[in-house]
């Protein structure tokens, strides 16, 4: 048994006579043999659900669900209730109605086994019948909405008549009907004014019925019509088996360069016309099991369940449904030497589905794991300026397809043929498995005999120790010019273009800092700043070379405080700044301030 509503509303007036009928509550059956029995909760409740008093005023007919006044609610009783409303004005009280037997905690009132009945209290006696407007004669102030479970026996779920009005104003004739299209499953009995379902409903065909209730009032020669919405929602049960959209029960996948744990290898989609179980219960009651195959497969893959609500068209209206994505995911990083082909089966079970048929599906994943070979081009040729400063980035080395790698740990090393000309270093970038070449020793750069540098680049897969090698030829160009006195170690210190460009700083490939002119659009990613190389700094990312020294690019790497208009970077640096941003790495501070517009004018005058 279940209530067709979770809440009911009626009006209460001072000194309304004992015996006055108030309203009916209705229960619908889950099974044909069920017989409803209603029970009122012990207490009346006020604002914020606080108990006010034992309910001594309202009774219920256990078999019919009729609520009526057992005793008149007078001024003093209402005052007594108001005093107990924890200091809030008392305008509405409510009762709880339970269906017997109930498994509910008495203290909780939750649909389907409990409904709240709200009474708006009017500190006046019931108005004269002639003064009541048609709207007041027809419908409660709060519009009802109904909930009906699909596949359940038909039954009565509403009674249109306002009982106090009918009881106290018998001379006013009120008639009701439902406006509905052809073939809808509802009926309003003209004599009893009870609304019932004609047959069991199917949510997968229609989930919402937006009906209209029409009330016609006859008072003497007067006839007036009032219309209100009469919405019915059909509640779901697990009566649909899971299916494969377009019959696709197999997915094929190749694992090659993406070998990292948590990589999604393949996805299969399952469709279920139901929206139960609810999201909180779903993963527990809608299970997926990777069927035992070989131990390697069990350890290497897992299945992740990702349910999502969708809507599908049925009989011209949209109803909700669920799509379940089952993702085959790598459970661990795969070595580049792994080379296997296998078929995996996943059993999906909609455990709440009662039939007919089975709520079970078998998903198939055909997976090929291909080995990866490490290859480097035979030779790299690069040039570097003699003026380059330490940590200047001068190029990249990368095994074939390294940009596509994930879960493959390649380390790069440089072996120099001339011991005294070992100028460069290499660090492996975690982002794209490439090796970044940078200036490590500026003294060697300046030696005249170090005009051409020869290296062997060795790439090693850390897991398997497999290697690839390449020649690296570096030409040293230009001549060394000593830097102006008083230049800071970090380009980022400079606040103006002129001072920026006449100094070098750590990380500068040319020996001179570069000015990046911002777009001046408030707090922007493209703020003005002084950088060792605008190719790499700032770019919103503190790369593996920049991490070696905070002076290289504090705009990307600083963990300290940023003063002025800015948006902090994740996890460090300046994501966006206002005007010009300059930094003092030693003090762990950056400042973002409006552009200094005097600068260009001053330059012109000084010339």
């Amino acid at each position: 048994l279940y209530f067709s509503r979770d809440a009911y509303w009626e009006k209460l007036y001072v000194d309304q006579a004992a015996g006055t009928p108030l309203l009916y509550v209705h229960a619908l059956r889950d099974a044909p043999e069920e017989v409803p029995s209603f029970r009122l909760g012990q207490h009346l409740y006020g604002t914020y659900r606080t108990r006010l008093h034992e309910n001594n005023w309202i009774c219920i007919q256990e078999d019919t669900g009729l609520l009526y006044l057992n005793r008149s609610l007078d001024h003093s009783s209402w005052e007594k209730l108001s005093v107990r409303n924890r200091g809030f004005p008392l305008l509405t009280v409510y009762l709880k109605v339970f269906l017997s037997p109930t498994s509910l905690r008495e203290g909780e009132c939750q649909w389907p086994g409990c409904a709240r009945v709200y009474f708006s209290f009017f500190n006046t006696s019931f108005p004269a019948c002639s003064s009541l407007k048609p709207r007041e004669l027809c419908f409660p102030e709060t519009r009802p909405s109904f909930r009906i479970r699909e596949n359940r026996p038909p039954g009565t779920f509403h009674q249109f008549r306002l009982l106090p009005v009918q009881f106290l104003c018998p001379n006013i004739s009120v008639a009701y009907r439902l406006l509905e299209g052809e073939g809808l499953p509802f009926r309003c009995a003209p004599d009893s004014l009870e609304v019932s379902t004609r047959w069991a409903l199917d949510r997968e065909q229609r989930e919402k019925y937006e009906l209209v209730a029409v009330c016609t009032v006859h008072a003497g020669a007067r006839e007036e019509v009032v219309m209100v919405p009469f919405p019915v929602t059909v509640y779901d049960e697990d009566d649909s088996a899971p299916t494969f959209p377009a019959g696709v029960d197999t997915a094929s996948a190749v694992v090659e360069f993406k070998r990292k744990e948590d990589t999604v290898v393949a996805t299969l989609r399952v469709f279920d016309a139901d929206v139960v179980p609810a999201s909180g219960e779903l993963v527990r009651r809608y299970t997926s099991t990777l069927l035992p195959g070989d131990t390697w497969a069990q350890q290497t893959f897992r299945v992740e369940h990702w349910p999502n609500e969708t809507s599908v068209q049925a009989n011209g209206s949209f109803v909700r449904a669920t799509v379940h994505d089952y993702r085959l995911v790598l459970n661990r990083n795969l070595s580049i030497s792994e080379n296997r082909t296998m078929q995996l089966a996943v059993l999906v079970n909609d455990s709440d589905f009662q039939g007919p048929g089975a709520g079970v599906l078998l998903l198939h994943f055909n997976v090929s794991v291909l080995p990866v070979s490490l290859h480097l081009p035979s030779t790299y040729s690069l040039s570097v300026s003699r003026r380059a400063r330490r940590f200047a980035q001068i190029g990249k080395v990368c095994v074939e397809n390294c940009q596509a790698f994930s879960g493959i740990n390649v380390q790069y090393k440089l072996h120099s043929s001339g011991a005294n000309c070992s100028t460069l270093g290499v660090v492996t970038s975690a982002e794209d498995t490439s090796g970044i070449l940078f200036v490590n020793d500026t003294k060697a750069l300046r030696r005249p005999k170090c005009a051409e540098l020869h290296y062997m680049v060795v790439a090693t897969d850390q897991q398997t120790s497999r290697q690839a090698q390449a020649q690296l030829l570096v030409t040293v160009e230009g001549s060394y010019v000593a830097e102006e006195a008083g230049c800071p170690l970090s380009c980022a210190v400079s606040k103006r273009r002129l001072e920026c460009e006449e100094c070098g700083g750590l990380g500068s490939p040319t020996g001179r800092c570069e000015w990046r002119q911002g777009d001046g659009k408030g707090i922007t990613r493209n703020f003005s700043t002084c950088s060792p190389s605008t190719k790499t700094c700032p770019d919103g990312h503190c790369d593996v070379v920049e991490t070696q020294d905070i002076n290289i690019c504090p705009q990307d790497c600083l963990r300290g405080s940023i003063v002025g208009g800015h948006e902090p970077g994740e996890p460090r640096g300046i994501k966006a700044g206002y005007g010009t941003c300059n930094c003092f790495p030693e003090e762990e501070k950056c400042f973002c301030e409006p552009e200094d517009i005097q600068d260009p004018l001053c330059d012109e005058l000084c010339r």
């Epitope: 409740y45 659900r49 108990r51 008495e106 203290g107």
Partner: antibody, heavy 122, light 107 residues
Framework: QVQLVESGGGVVQPGRSLRLSCAAS????????MHWVRQAPGKGLEWVAV????????YYADSVKGRFIISRDNSKSTLYLEMNSLRAEDTALYYC???????????????WGQGTTVTVSS | DIQMTQSPSSLFASVGDRVTITCRAS??????LGWYQQKPGKAPKRLIY???ILESGVPSRFSGSGSGTEYTLTISTLQSEDFAIYYC?????????FGQGTKVEIK
């Protein structure tokens, strides 16, 4: 009718343990939070512990925290109080009581047992 | 923890008297206070909860009032069966705490 019956009291030496039980009948035990309250001879009432209706949560008075453990078996409609490292000051009449909880509010304890006596003495 | 201070600790009264017992909380307990009656050798019995709601079956001569930190139990016309010890209990936050009790004795 609604009834709570405590048992398991007795004389025990300091430092020893004792387990009290409270058998409930006449109501849906699994729907109610349950409490232990004690009263030392000639003294006032002292709240001891509570356990949620579903066993998901518990609270203790500072005087018993870390020594007493409240538990329940909803299938047997029984509340327990495991009392360890007993002291002379734990000597009291121990009552079990049903919590009155409604729509998110606590309203104290509405049904009490008759109590069981615990005497801690060497 | 919330402390409950109950006064007086004892009082002497005659049948027909009006009796008032007060409980003060160390902080606002938002109406979450109950009154319990205990007779010798018996378990406590709830008279009033949520400051002013009378327990079913309790005579209407008992009434409760108060808010914030100050609460009162009133017996409008004392009867012979009302001679007992009365306790207040705050049920606003754990640990719940009782007042020390008020013994109502025959004058």
């Amino acid at each position: 009718q609604v009834q709570l019956v405590e048992s398991g009291g007795g004389v025990v030496q300091p430092g020893r343990s004792l387990r009290l039980s409270c058998a409930a009948s006449g109501f849906s035990f699994s729907s109610y939070g349950m409490h232990w309250v004690r009263q030392a001879p000639g003294k006032g009432l002292e709240w001891v512990a509570v356990m949620w209706y579903d066993g998901s949560n518990e609270y203790y008075a500072d005087s018993v925290k870390g020594r007493f453990i409240i538990s329940r078996d909803n299938s047997k409609s029984t509340l327990y109080l495991e009392m360890n490292s007993l002291r002379a000051e734990d000597t009291a009449l121990y009552y079990c009581a049903r919590e009155d909880w409604d729509e998110g509010y606590y309203y104290g304890m509405d049904v009490w047992g008759q109590g069981t006596t615990v005497t801690v003495s060497s | 923890d919330i402390q409950m201070t109950q006064s007086p600790s004892s009082l002497f009264a005659s049948v027909g008297d009006r009796v008032t017992i007060t409980c003060r909380a160390s902080q606002d307990i938002r109406y979450d206070l109950g009154w319990y009656q205990q007779k010798p050798g018996k378990a406590p019995k709830r008279l009033i909860y949520a400051s002013s709601i009378l327990e079913s079956g309790v005579p209407s001569r008992f009434s409760g009032s108060g808010s914030g930190t100050e609460y009162t139990l009133t017996i409008s016309t004392l009867q012979s069966e009302d001679f007992a010890i009365y306790y207040c209990l705050q049920h606003n936050s754990f640990p719940w705490t009782f007042g020390q009790g008020t013994k109502v004795e025959i004058k």
